[in-house]
């Protein structure tokens, strides 16, 4: 699920239903955001690489009491093969950089879109 680039000929392959739903949820969050997401909570930035789903979950799981991202947290847990709990960090975190949840979600969405488009466009 984490390998999206380099689609085989003749064209791109659509995502699994789970990944499609994750992308749609990220789109909903970014498009429907009015007040600061999660009251402007800050999370650790991550390296958007092969283990990004677990890293994203490890970062977002430290945000509590924010209903807007609860569905995203549940979805990400489905992509991460190991159990993730608050306070847990992997080497994929950029531990010196914290960003707002809204920016984190936007970055994750942009990265997923980029991966799909790399397989689609010349």
């Amino acid at each position: 699920l984490t390998c999206l680039g380099g689609f085989a000929s003749p064209g791109p392959v659509p995502p699994s239903t789970a990944l499609r739903e994750l992308i749609e949820e990220l789109v909903n969050i970014t498009q429907n955001q009015k007040a600061p997401l999660c009251n402007g909570s800050m999370v650790w930035s991550i390296n958007l690489t092969a283990g990004m789903y677990c890293a994203a979950l490890e970062s977002l799981i430290n945000v509590s009491g924010c209903s807007a991202i609860e569905k995203t947290q549940r979805m990400l847990s489905g992509f991460c093969p190991h159990k993730v709990s608050a306070g847990q960090f992997s080497s994929l975190h950029v531990r010196d950089t914290k960003i707002e949840v809204a920016q984190f979600v936007k970055d994750l969405l942009l990265h997923l879109k980029k991966l799909f488009r790399e397989g689609q466009f010349n």
Partner: antibody
């Protein structure tokens, strides 16, 4: 609200080229792909190709490679389609549409541009 | 290329009728199937996405079903304003392809 405003109808000579425009508003232009469709009574709705406005990357239907050239200008939120070496077969209504990612539906369409190729 | 076949080509209905429009893909496209309505002299408009998901602003009388290669668009009580051509679209793989359409007309 989201709008895709297309350029007006064109009457062009065989062998000539024409450039159609599609100006997007009401959303962030680089967040969505722009896809182009051709509609004729004989062939119905055909997908010509798509462009990622952020990178300028393109994807074409093999049938329209060499016929259509897709470009986009981020600064004006406008996508363009140049049609080359026109023949009567290119007479059609052309639509621009937006799609988040290629497997998504075409959720907004332009009003269409009628192109007539005639001497 | 994935070929999308729609039937019937034309459907003559009476207001209040329940109608079903069929779309068949030449290969398995899972639920990557979208439906559009095009009224005379208008652009197409999205009715249903991913075979069965409703679209905001579209009347609830429109519904979709199916998966794999066989799909159906249903209108549970046709209104006079539903007259037009209905297209199904393969969203699974390039090139994106559409059916030839089903024309819905009033008797």
């Amino acid at each position: 609200q989201v709008q895709l405003q297309q350029s007006g109808a064109d009457l062009v000579r065989p062998g000539a080229s024409v450039t159609l425009s599609c100006k997007a508003s009401g959303y962030t232009f680089i967040d969505y792909e722009i896809h182009w469709m051709k509609q004729t009574p004989v062939h119905g709705l055909e997908w010509i190709g798509a462009i990622d406005p952020e990178t300028g990357g393109t994807a074409y239907n093999q049938k329209f490679k060499g016929k259509a050239i897709l470009t986009a200008d981020k600064s004006s939120s406008t996508a363009y389609m140049e049609l080359r070496s026109l023949t009567s077969e290119d007479s059609a209504v052309y639509y621009c549409t937006r799609i988040l990612l290629y497997y998504y539906p075409m959720d907004y369409w332009g009003q269409g541009t009628s192109v007539t190729v005639s001497s | 290329d994935i070929v999308m076949t729609q039937s019937p080509a034309t459907l003559s209905v009476t207001p209040g009728d329940r109608v079903s429009l069929s779309c068949r893909a030449s290969q398995n496209i899972s639920d990557y199937l979208h439906w559009y309505q095009q009224k005379s002299h208008e652009s197409p408009r999205l009715l249903i996405k991913y075979a069965s998901q409703s679209i905001s602003g579209i009347p609830s009388r429109f519904s979709g079903s199916g998966s794999g290669s066989d799909f159906t668009l249903s209108i549970n009580s046709v209104e006079p304003e539903d007259v037009g051509v209905y297209y199904c679209q393969n969203g699974h793989s390039f090139p994106l392809t559409l059916g030839a359409g089903t024309k819905l007309e009033l008797k």
